[in-house]
């Protein structure tokens, strides 16, 4: 019968007796930076070719048993997850492998460097399709490899690595914090995240999704024949660099933005059991298990956006957190959250020629997350429209006035500490979707998009008084881009999306004594592109 | 032993053909950062990713690699350039005393130095 | 269940050998590095050796270094510990335990033992 | 001898607070190793206690702490009760050995 782990990346339409996804990948080359491999396995014969690279530590002491099949554990059993006969994802994809562990599984930072020009060097000399590189290792945080990391993936390169097995923020580790590599994270048969003995895999922002990494069936070194389980967060960065074979081999053309974002899209969503994670990372640490898509083509007409969170911006009065969007993606709303609820708003801004986010944390607040809300939006002209703060009773209101130019986010930021103190805004009349409305201290910016196509529309839900959460989706076909709550009193804790959500966090009245005319509304702006769609079916 | 003879001719070299090292001086203002492993039995003193500024040809990588060497003999240390890089990062890598790294650190074209570190299989 | 299963001890005579084993279930087996601790009458726990997860390390306390040797087979699920030149002072409670193979980047602790098998080693 | 060093017994009267110190050096406490604490019941095999310097997993009491600086660590149990009377061993890992190291075991006796 079909592995677990087989199935669950596998989307029902596929799941028979076996598993036989259509196109296993057979465009793509995949690059793995790991031991050495057992080559002749049945397994991954003829699939991986082995590359005279070779740049490892001496191993530490004289207790080493350097028997090949002693050293080659971690990389074959890999290789046969990414692309084995029985028991791999994208059974067509070739391989090559670089030796930069050692018998240990010890390398460094410098030798991964070196893997790493070296692959970029066999990319110019011999340019073929297109190229996932593999990166089940971690380190402390390394400055310089993830700066290789961001020059190989703006050379087209895709780069998949391990989230890390130490039941601790991603972000502490390299190659995992580095924003232009998909950072995998490990989930079980059940779910749940990860133990690895006490610790287990790592979360948080940097952590892009997780995939199958317990007791996962592969080619053991053993012997040529031999299969073993191993656990662990390579074995769910293998995974994700089949699933990412797949998808190249089906769409080569696909950028790395691109193919970030479906794999985000067509992931299992909500269903791993947030309880494991400390409480401070649960809202960073997105709720995803990679997953085939259901059909390699015809996904294109979707509007794809995804939610990057900042750093934390840390405790001092001025402190700021600035989130941003990938290259060819546009950063369609800014939101912020604050766990103690003390914080200044947002605002987009402009730096190095394309839109960020920024939060403001405010005078005794723990510190501020900016949340962007990052979007594929091909040709498309972004620009944001600020009012400053109205000081009316109405509240403070923007739109967008340029023709074509429809609303996708709004932001709000304050210079008083505490708007709490201040009357709240009326709400926003209804029918006026292009407008954004705030607290007549804040000003108010507006991110105003012309696409070919692009159409949306504000959703909201207000609860009388906070309940410590509210919500508003998007329906099928539409897409959230926006996420933003009113009034922004200081009971507001923030707003962010998740996945098709907007979530707005607020104190529970009963720790507060808020009264209940402190009503929290959810804004949802929703988005589709008429275009897209049309697109994908003239194409079909 | 002939390791060290290698790298000691290595070095006679770079002095002759370096003049006084000092031609050019960092650009001002901009000061080179020093990394390392915040994890301290991950760390791998002794050898170091000298990162220079993103538009510096492979020559100048090179060049200021001997230049390096040759500061450093003066000094009485013995360094070994273990390889230049160039294709993704412009920079080398260096095998020396982490004495020479204020020295290293006011190189022309150096944007940061990081101690080297190790990684693990996962 | 996560359990460990030792089992091979008695009574052997000085200079004499033993082979225990250490049955495991419950768990990604090959993941872990397997350890053997021994524990003499009234005394302390002692590390007796320690195999990493591929059997690529072996590593021995000074005081059985030479003597014993060991093994696993990640097929079978099972860890051994061949104890040759037996002495008197090797006389003590045998446990195995697990811990998650770091490749060296974290030494774990001992999260699952086993009950332990006594060895006794006298004329 | 044992390369960690804990005093061989402490005692305590229900309700009290008792620590154990385990003492190592710059091979393994202090070298960055990490430092983890048993239990053991008499007749029982050891239960991991605290991980990681002062972890605790899942069922252990919030009773049981641990702390580590420089190249010492201690585990601090407050509220003693009857049942936490025991063995306690901290453990590390030694680079000179390459191998784990155990401290000598501590007897902890809750009086009355």
């Known amino acids: 019968s079909i592995p677990w782990n087989l199935e669950r990346i596998t989307p029902p339409r596929y799941r028979a007796d076996e598993y036989q996804p259509p196109d296993g990948g057979s465009l793509v080359e995949v690059y793995l930076l790991d031991t050495s491999i057992q080559s002749d396995h049945r397994e991954i014969e003829g699939r991986v070719m082995v590359t005279d690279f070779e740049n490892v530590p001496e191993e530490d002491g004289t207790r080493f048993h350097r028997q090949a099949s002693k050293c080659d554990s971690h990389g074959t059993h890999l290789a046969g997850v990414v692309s084995g006969r029985d028991a791999g994802v994208a059974k067509g994809a070739s391989m090559r492998s670089l030796r930069v562990l050692n018998c240990q599984g010890k390398g460094t930072v410098s030798g991964t460097l070196i893997g790493l020009e070296f692959i970029r060097k066999s990319q110019l000399v011999q340019p073929v399709g297109p190229l996932v590189v593999l990166l089940p290792l971690a380190g402390g945080y390394s400055r310089v490899l993830n700066a290789a990391c961001q020059r190989l993936a703006r050379a087209g390169v895709v780069l998949v690595t391990a989230a890390g097995n130490f039941r601790d923020d991603a972000c502490l580790y390299s190659p995992a914090s580095a924003p232009e590599v998909i950072t995998v994270g490990a989930t079980n048969a059940q779910d749940q995240p990860v133990t690895l003995g006490t610790l287990g895999t790592n979360f948080g922002r940097c952590v892009d999704l997780f995939a199958p990494g317990e007791d996962i069936i592969g080619a053991s070194s053993d012997c040529s024949t031999c299969f073993v389980s191993q656990s662990g967060t390579s074995q769910a960065a293998a995974h994700v660099a089949g699933i990412a074979a797949m998808m190249l081999s089906a769409e080569p053309e696909l950028t790395l933005a691109e193919l970030r974002q479906r794999l985000i899209h067509f992931s299992a969503k909500d269903v791993i059991n947030e309880a494991w994670f400390p409480e401070d990372q649960r809202v960073l640490t997105p709720n995803l298990v990679a997953a085939l898509p259901p059909s390699t083509h015809g996904a294109g007409w979707q509007l794809f956006c995804r939610t990057v969170w900042s750093a934390h911006s840390g405790p001092t009065r001025m402190a700021t957190a600035i989130a941003r969007c990938a290259p060819d993606e546009e950063l369609l709303s800014c939101s912020s959250f604050s766990r103690s609820g003390k914080r200044r708003g947002e605002r987009m801004e402009a730096q190095g020629g394309k839109l960020v986010c920024r939060a403001h944390n405010a005078f005794g607040g723990e510190g501020v997350y900016a949340i962007a809300r990052c979007c594929l939006l091909p040709q498309a002209n972004c620009s944001v429209h600020t009012a400053p703060p109205a000081e009316a009773s109405m509240g403070t209101r923007v739109h967008c006035h340029q023709q074509g130019h429809v609303l996708t986010g709004c932001s709000s930021h304050w210079e008083v500490e505490d708007l709490g103190t201040h009357k709240p805004p009326v709400l926003r009349p209804r029918g006026q979707p292009n407008q954004c409305v705030g607290h007549r201290e804040a000003s108010i910016h507006a991110s105003c998009c012309h696409a070919p196509g692009l159409e949306c529309k504000v959703k909201e839900h207000g609860i009388p008084a906070p309940q410590g959460q509210v919500t508003v989706a998007c329906e099928e076909g539409w897409t959230l881009t926006g996420c933003s709550a009113l009034p922004g009193t200081s009971h507001v804790l923030g707003a962010y999306a998740v996945d098709n959500t907007c979530v707005v966090r607020s104190r529970d009245v009963s720790t507060t004594g808020s009264t209940s005319e402190e009503a929290v509304t959810a804004v949802a702006i929703c988005c589709r592109s008429r275009h897209l769609a049309q697109a994908s079916q003239e194409l079909q | 032993q002939e390791d060290e003879d290698g790298d000691y001719e290595e070095l006679v070299l770079a002095l002759r053909s370096e003049e006084d090292g000092l031609a050019e001086a960092p650009e001002h203002g901009t000061t080179a950062t020093f990394h390392r492993c915040a994890k301290d039995p991950w760390r791998l003193p002794g050898t170091y990713v000298v990162v220079l500024k993103e538009e510096t040809h492979l020559s100048q990588s090179e060049r200021t690699a001997r230049r390096l060497q040759a500061q450093a003999a003066r000094r009485g240390y013995l360094t070994k350039i273990l390889h230049v890089f160039h294709g993704l990062l412009p920079g080398f890598l260096v095998k020396m005393s982490g004495d020479l790294l204020e020295l290293a650190l006011k190189l022309p074209h150096v944007d940061y130095i990081e101690e080297d570190s190790s990684v693990f299989a996962q | 269940e996560v359990q460990l299963v030792e089992s091979g001890g008695g009574l052997v005579k000085p200079g004499g050998s033993l082979r225990l084993s250490c049955a495991a279930s419950?768990?990604?087996?090959?993941?872990?590095?397997m350890n053997w601790v021994r524990q003499a009458p009234g005394k302390g726990l002692e590390w007796v050796s320690s195999?990493?997860?591929?059997?690529?390390?072996?590593s021995y306390a000074d005081s059985v270094k030479g003597r014993f040797t060991i093994s696993r087979d990640n097929a079978k699920n099972s860890l051994y510990l061949q104890m040759n030149s037996l002495r008197a002072e090797d006389t003590a409670v045998y446990f195995c335990?697990?811990?998650?193979?770091?490749?060296?980047?974290?030494?774990?602790?001992?999260?699952?033992w086993g009950q332990g098998t006594m060895v006794t080693v006298s004329s | 001898e044992s390369v960690l060093t804990q005093p061989p017994s402490v005692s305590g009267a229900p309700g009290q607070r008792v620590t154990i110190s385990c003492t190592g050096s710059?091979?393994?406490?202090?070298?960055?190793?990490?430092v983890h604490w048993y239990q053991q019941l008499p007749g029982t095999a050891p239960k991991l206690l605290i991980s990681?310097?002062?972890n605790r997993p899942s069922g252990v009491p919030d009773r049981f702490s641990g702390s580590k600086s420089g190249t010492s660590a201690s585990l601090a149990i407050t509220g003693l009760q009857a049942e936490d009377e025991a063995d306690y061993y901290c453990?590390?890992?030694?680079?000179?050995?390459?191998?784990?190291?155990f401290g000598g075991g501590t007897k902890l006796t809750v009086l009355g």
């Open positions: 335990a697990r811990d998650y193979d770091f490749h060296s980047a974290y030494h774990d602790a001992f999260d699952v």
């Open positions: 419950g768990f990604t087996f090959s993941s872990y590095s």
């Open positions: 195999i990493s997860s591929s059997s690529s390390y072996h």
């Open positions: 710059s091979s393994n406490i202090g070298a960055g190793y990490d």
């Open positions: 990681g310097n002062s």
């Open positions: 453990q590390s890992y030694d680079s000179s050995l390459s191998g784990s190291v």
